[in-house]
């Protein structure tokens, strides 16, 4: 069978080889398509409900005024010339529709290096057959499931037209120290050969490099956190990050109801101030970061200060 590719909605003429150019003709077209269950016979004298789909022209050719998805299939013509010689024509018709230019929607303007990010969703509407979407980084194809690249795909079919809508969501994990302005694009490749790919306009998100977090240091005075009754303890939270984060204080795992401050002073220590203290630094670009915990305890006269804590009460300190 001769392969014929026709665009949906366009007319198509199939020649009946060996047919006399004018009536009377002895010819018969048979079609087996999405509109038939077996073979449908169309003859030159036939005219009827099938004319909207296919009709035999005076020269014996079969005319399809507007090819549709249901017209995919086999078309055969059997003709006899004036001398009684029989000729058969056999066509396999496949149809296609090129979608509109694909688009990237919900695109990110900024990506964070070292963590997975959604770059955007590529959408192609109105294709047949479905075809495929692929992503490119700086013009080179991105391979899903390689080097922190993942793609989530979805294909939907329009209930009336039968045309396809494709969606492809790209997630990437940019390498630290990589390109600060990578160029992403997406392209649609048709399901039928000999049709070039359609590419989206590129997007260029910025890649933000998070500064590696240095540890939050908690310095206690006196060292070791053991103090005589009535003494003073100063806790200082040191965070190297710029700009300076907000510092909150915790005692025994519970936030202290105090305004943010990098220094906590516990004057005139009493039994209620004993416990485990830590500070929490909250950065605008990161989550909260907690320091190590230190134990504050009271030494009775003649006792040596312990370095590990005892359970304390609920007294509040003073902020510097």
């Amino acid at each position: 069978a001769q392969n014929i590719t026709a665009r949906i909605g366009e007319p198509l003429v199939l020649k009946c080889k060996g047919a006399p150019k004018k009536p009377p003709q002895r010819l018969e077209w048979k079609l087996n398509t999405g509109r038939t269950e077996a073979w449908k016979v169309l003859s030159p004298q036939g005219g009827g409900p099938w004319d909207s789909v296919a009709r035999v022209l005076p020269n014996g050719s079969l005319f399809l005024p507007a090819v549709g998805i249901q017209d995919e299939g086999i078309f055969r013509c059997q003709a006899m010339n004036r001398n009684g010689k029989e000729t058969k024509s056999n066509y396999r018709v496949r149809v296609y529709q090129i979608p509109g230019k694909p688009e990237i929607v919900d695109s990110a303007s900024e990506l964070t290096a070292g963590v997975p990010n959604k770059v955007g969703t590529c959408v192609s509407e109105g294709s047949y057959p479905a075809g495929t979407l692929s992503w490119h980084l700086d013009g080179k194809p991105l391979v899903p499931n390689e080097k922190g690249v993942s793609v989530k795909e979805q294909t939907r079919r329009h209930p009336e037209t039968g045309l396809f809508t494709l969606q492809s969501e790209l997630m990437v994990t940019p390498a630290r120290g990589g390109d600060p302005r990578p160029t992403f694009s997406c392209s649609f490749s048709p399901g039928l050969p000999r049709h070039r790919a359609l590419r989206t306009a590129p997007i260029q998100p910025r890649v933000w490099e998070p500064v590696p977090l240095e540890e939050v240091q908690l310095v206690v005075e006196p060292e070791g956190g053991a103090v005589a009754p009535g003494g003073t303890v100063t806790l200082t939270c040191e965070v190297p990050a710029q700009p300076s984060p907000q510092i909150h204080w915790m005692k025994d795992g519970v936030p202290l109801p105090l305004p943010p401050s990098p220094v906590l002073i516990l004057p005139e220590i009493g039994p209620q101030d004993q416990g485990t203290y830590s500070c929490v630094a909250t950065h605008s670009s990161h989550g909260p970061q907690e320091s190590r915990a230190v134990s504050i305890s009271i030494i009775e006269p003649g006792e040596e200060g312990p370095t590990a804590g005892s359970v304390g009460g609920s007294g509040l300190g003073t902020l510097a």
Epitope: R35, G47, P49, W50, D51, V53
Partner: antibody, heavy 119, light 107 residues
Framework: EVQLVESGGGLVQPGGSLRLSCAAS????????MTWVRQAPGKGLEWVAS????????YYPDSVKDRFTISRDNAKNSLYLQMNSLRAEDTAVYYC????????????WGQGTLVTVSS | DIQMTQSPSSLSASVGDRVTITCRAS??????VNWFQQKPGKAPRRLIY???NLADGVPSRFSGSRSGTDFTLTISSLQPEDFATYYC?????????FGGGTKVEIK
């Protein structure tokens, strides 16, 4: 909403003529074949004529061929049936319907218009 | 020309009954058969298209089936508003041919 409204029916003498109209709205008229169907009093449905979406091709049963002519004006979203040489057996309610080909077949109908052929 | 032989021409049934109407085509018409409902003084309304597909807005108690050149309309549980006349139509070839109709009456 698809709407088809017939008009032009009435009483006519045998051998006379009548022109029926069907005004279409609520859909892209020139995308569809159109058809006339009739129903004699107390009887079943009978196909009368069909026309393709361009108006280039028309189809009739033997019972009305050469007497009836179906036509359309796509600019006016209108379908017509010119009936000549009318006979008593043409007395019926005439319906216009959308479709008539294998793609869309009579999915919407007008309310009908009565044609009476009598002396 | 294709003949569409519809049976029965009339039937009496009660609300809740299952009703079956058949049309036999005199030659192969593929899937190109519709079913219509008509009430007195009203235009026909399409119920089933291309043998088995339920038209928009038609209750699911109506269904269509096909076996070769035999086409069946089934009403699974007859409702008071279903008492009407039903017609089949073949639209595979001209002349388009309707069945003779089946009048469904209250028993």
């Amino acid at each position: 909403e698809v709407q088809l409204v017939e008009s032009g029916g009435g009483l006519v003498q045998p051998g006379g003529s009548l022109r029926l109209s069907c005004a279409a709205s609520g859909f892209t008229f020139n995308n569809y074949w159109m058809t006339w169907v009739r129903q004699a009093p107390g009887k079943g449905l009978e196909w009368v004529a069909s026309i393709d979406n361009s108006g280039d091709n028309t189809y009739y049963p033997d019972s009305v061929k050469d007497r009836f002519t179906i036509s359309r004006d796509n600019a006016k979203n209108s379908l017509y049936l010119q009936m000549n040489s009318l006979r008593a057996e043409d007395t019926a309610v005439y319906y216009c319907a959308r479709g008539g080909d294998i793609k869309v077949s009579l999915d919407h109908w007008g309310q009908g218009t009565l044609v009476t052929v009598s002396s | 020309d294709i003949q569409m032989t519809q049976s029965p021409s009339s039937l009496s049934a009660s609300v809740g009954d299952r009703v079956t109407i058949t049309c036999r085509a005199s030659q192969d018409v593929g899937i190109y058969v519709n079913w219509f409902q008509q009430k007195p003084g009203k235009a026909p309304r399409r119920l089933i298209y291309r043998a088995t597909n339920l038209a928009d807005g038609v209750p699911s108690r109506f269904s269509g089936s096909r076996s070769g050149t035999d086409f069946t309309l089934t009403i699974s549980s007859l409702q008071p508003e279903d008492f009407a006349t039903y017609y089949c139509l073949e639209f595979d070839e001209h002349p388009l041919t309707f069945g003779g109709g089946t009048k469904v009456e209250i028993k």
